[in-house]
Interface confidence: low
């Protein structure tokens, strides 16, 4: 093994390097000293380092480490941030188009139901957007509210246009009758199933992407432990104390130090792998009724079918509702 | 029969859109994202190695620093960590992660559980109980890939493609509908969102 080169007799090289780290401070000994106060760069002989220099090296080592960590995650972070933004925007646009399709269906097929239908459709799709973004809304309630609101308008405008406009009393009765008599058949339940499944998946997909960003941000801004700071200092800077300015750490040594410093971070690995594989599984299943684009853009058709179903059974329904809501109607006509 | 909100309905039931090769869709964009994410699947386990390879380490030099002294790069001493009697690396590794890391692990565990719960069983279209309740007509069969309608009259197949989505918007005629603030024709930036999904790297 070659003998170590003699330390810098004057500490001049060390001083000039250290001045770049800490301009104007006279912490570097003029000539090598015993260094008995050192805690990290424990000397085998005279050293050009002081306790204050060690502290500065530790700070610099930690900053280096933080920068290396941030540059390591930059590409991944950008990938997830960009995609989270793109998908969120795309989902919002799908919702907007789905709303427009539904409004157009009402305008073209049932002009007498507008503008009330537009209002109800607007509220429904606003709730859809809020749900996707994580709002605490029940999808079944959203769908029920849409059909509860639509039926009184369908009844008074399409099925029984002779009723007076001020049908406030009968409206409440009609909302109740809508569910009791299953006036839309199984369509509300079908829509509930399709919308809830597709929106749940969409929502969890966005949540997962946003958590991905949070994971990277967390590890991006990690602080390192004292022990890690000392090990990094010893690896990157202690050689300077011996005047060895150009020497680099051994590769195997670096790996050991990094594994020690990153022990906590590496614990994320298992869950990170699982996260990506679980996300892949979810994405593979995002089709048919689990694909919000597919479901929402077809809603206008299903809603149209549900209204046709009501019209097909209009005779039977009008008679039943006439009896059921007779009390409300009598009060209205008085 | 119903007047549908666009001219692309040929027979008023089935939406027929010519399939364009390499068309950018939401689902293809999702799959592309997953493929890119999978290239980062070992990100955390590879971090120590990555940082060493991006910080100064002796590669071509004969001598290297082992934390205590200058040694030959291929010697036994170089392989040792140079920390004997100073810091116990084992103890350092035994310490759990910093609390913020523990907290993020907990969040990952939670989202992974949710993702697994939400993953769709292969080959399922509708819940069994829905099929059993039955519809007036035209229930969806397993072989009907994109079936989303309820009754036969309004059955509709949708090609899940964003280009179709963007183009279709032009044919909607709700701009002049009273009480409807949403314009049917998407703004330029919306269309570019759809077409440029592939530009995100």
């Amino acid at each position: 093994q070659p003998p170590p080169p003699p330390p810098d007799a004057t500490c001049h090289q060390v001083r000039s390097f250290f001045q770049r780290l800490q301009p104007g401070l006279k912490w570097v000994p003029e000539t090598p000293v015993p260094g008995s106060d050192l805690q990290v760069c424990l000397p085998k002989g005279p050293t050009c380092c002081s306790r204050k220099m060690e502290e500065k090296y530790q700070l610099t080592a930690r900053l280096n480490m933080e920068q290396l960590l941030q540059s390591a995650s930059m590409e991944l972070k950008f990938l997830i941030i960009q995609n989270a933004a793109v998908f969120q925007e795309a989902f919002e646009i799908v919702v907007r188009h789905a709303k427009n399709y539904t409004n157009a269906m009402f305008k073209n097929n049932y002009p007498s139901l507008t503008p009330q239908a537009f209002e109800f459709v607007g509220e429904f799709f606003t709730d859809v957007s809020l749900y996707i973004l994580g709002s605490d809304i029940n999808v079944d309630d959203m769908v029920n509210e849409l059909f509860d609101s639509l039926f009184p308008v369908i009844y008074t405008q399409l099925m029984n246009p002779g009723l007076p406009d001020s049908a406030l009393d009968i409206n409440e009765c009609l909302r109740g009758a809508r569910r009791d008599l299953k006036v839309f058949g199984n369509f509300p339940k079908l829509i509930m199933t399709q919308v809830s499944k597709s929106l749940q998946v969409t929502r969890i997909f966005l949540q997962a992407l946003n958590l991905g960003i949070e994971v990277i941000n967390t590890t991006d801004h990690l602080k390192f432990s004292k022990d890690c700071g000392r090990m990094l200092t010893r690896m990157w800077y202690c050689s300077y104390c011996q005047g060895l300015m150009m020497v680099k750490p051994c590769g195997g040594y670096c790996n050991v130090v990094m594994q020690g410093c990153m022990a906590g971070v590496v614990e994320i690995d298992k869950y990170w792998r699982e996260y990506i594989l679980s996300l892949e599984e979810l994405v593979n299943g995002m089709y048919r009724i689990y694909d919000m684009e597919n479901v929402l853009l077809g809603l206008f058709s299903t809603i149209h079918d549900s209204i046709q179903y009501v019209q097909k059974n209009a005779g039977k329904l009008t008679t039943t509702i006439g009896k059921l809501c007779a009390h409300s109607q009598q009060r209205q006509y008085r | 029969s119903a007047y549908y909100p666009e001219d692309l309905f040929i027979d008023k039931k089935v939406l027929k859109v010519a399939h364009v090769e390499h068309e950018e869709t939401l689902s293809s964009r999702r799959r592309e994202l997953i493929q890119k994410l999978k290239s980062f699947i070992s990100f955390y386990s590879a971090l120590p190695g990555y940082i060493c390879s991006h910080s100064p380490v002796a590669e071509n030099d004969t001598l290297c620093w082992n934390g205590q002294e200058l040694v030959e790069r291929y010697s036994q001493k170089a392989a040792r960590n140079g920390m004997k009697n100073q810091f116990n690396l084992h103890e350092l590794k035994m310490k759990g992660p910093e609390p913020v890391v523990s907290q993020i692990i907990d969040k990952l565990k939670h989202i992974n559980q949710l993702l697994r719960t939400m993953s769709v069983p292969k080959g399922r279209v509708l819940d069994k109980n829905l099929d059993e309740e039955g519809f007036e007509s035209g229930d969806c069969g397993d072989d009907e890939d994109e079936c989303i309608g309820g009754s036969g009259d309004g059955m509709m197949k949708v090609k899940n493609q964003l280009r179709f989505l963007a183009e279709l918007a032009y044919d909607l005629d709700v701009d002049d509908v009273p009480g409807n603030n949403q314009q049917a024709t998407p703004k330029d930036n919306e269309i570019s969102t759809f077409h440029n999904l592939g530009n995100v790297h």
Partner: antibody, heavy 124, light 108 residues
Amino acid sequence: QVQLQESGGGVVQPGRSLRLSCAASGFTFSSYAMHWVRQAPGKGLEWVAVISYDGSNKYYADSVKGRFTISRDNSKNTLYLQMNSLRAEDTAVYYCAKEGTYYYDSSGYWDYYYGMDVWGQGTT
Amino acid sequence: DVVMTQSPLSLPVTPGEPASISCRSSQSLLDSDGYNFLDWYVQKPGQSPQRLIYLGSIRASGVPDRFSGSGSGTDFTLKISRVEADDVGVYYCMQALQTPWTFGQGTK
């Protein structure tokens, strides 16, 4: 210095409600989990509830589950315990305690410590 | 729930003599990371509890080195090498491995 100050205790009839507060000072409240522990007259310590640093996770002792709710307002550095449907056996001194999880020294490095490292003086 | 059992429940000691308190858990408190999630607290007369030992054997800051914690898994011991008059109080062990956290009955 690090301090926890409980308040809100008092005498109420069984079945009624009470809300305890714990004002924290001298540390970054939003970084630490917080506990409520109680001690019935002449008896030992009984752990009641814990809330995570951000309020997202809460755990309760079986004896209070469904009746007590732990919450926190990080903007006010305050921990709360909402006690509903109170029973005679809930009579106790209630302590709030900070869970010591880690600390940062002056140079910004962190190190660990565990356990409930700071306790309030209690409210009855 | 994890049941914590302390013995003895009362321990008369003469100042200068050693003292030892045992704590047994109904299940292992050894975490997969190798930590024993057991803490020791003391409550002096008229005061709030204060932490003595955490993770089975680590002395809390400011605690005299007369106090030591040992043990692993289900059996733990708190030792005071030389008792002082100021050490009077009730000593509790507590497991923090899983919710609900549970205390021993206390040793006076």
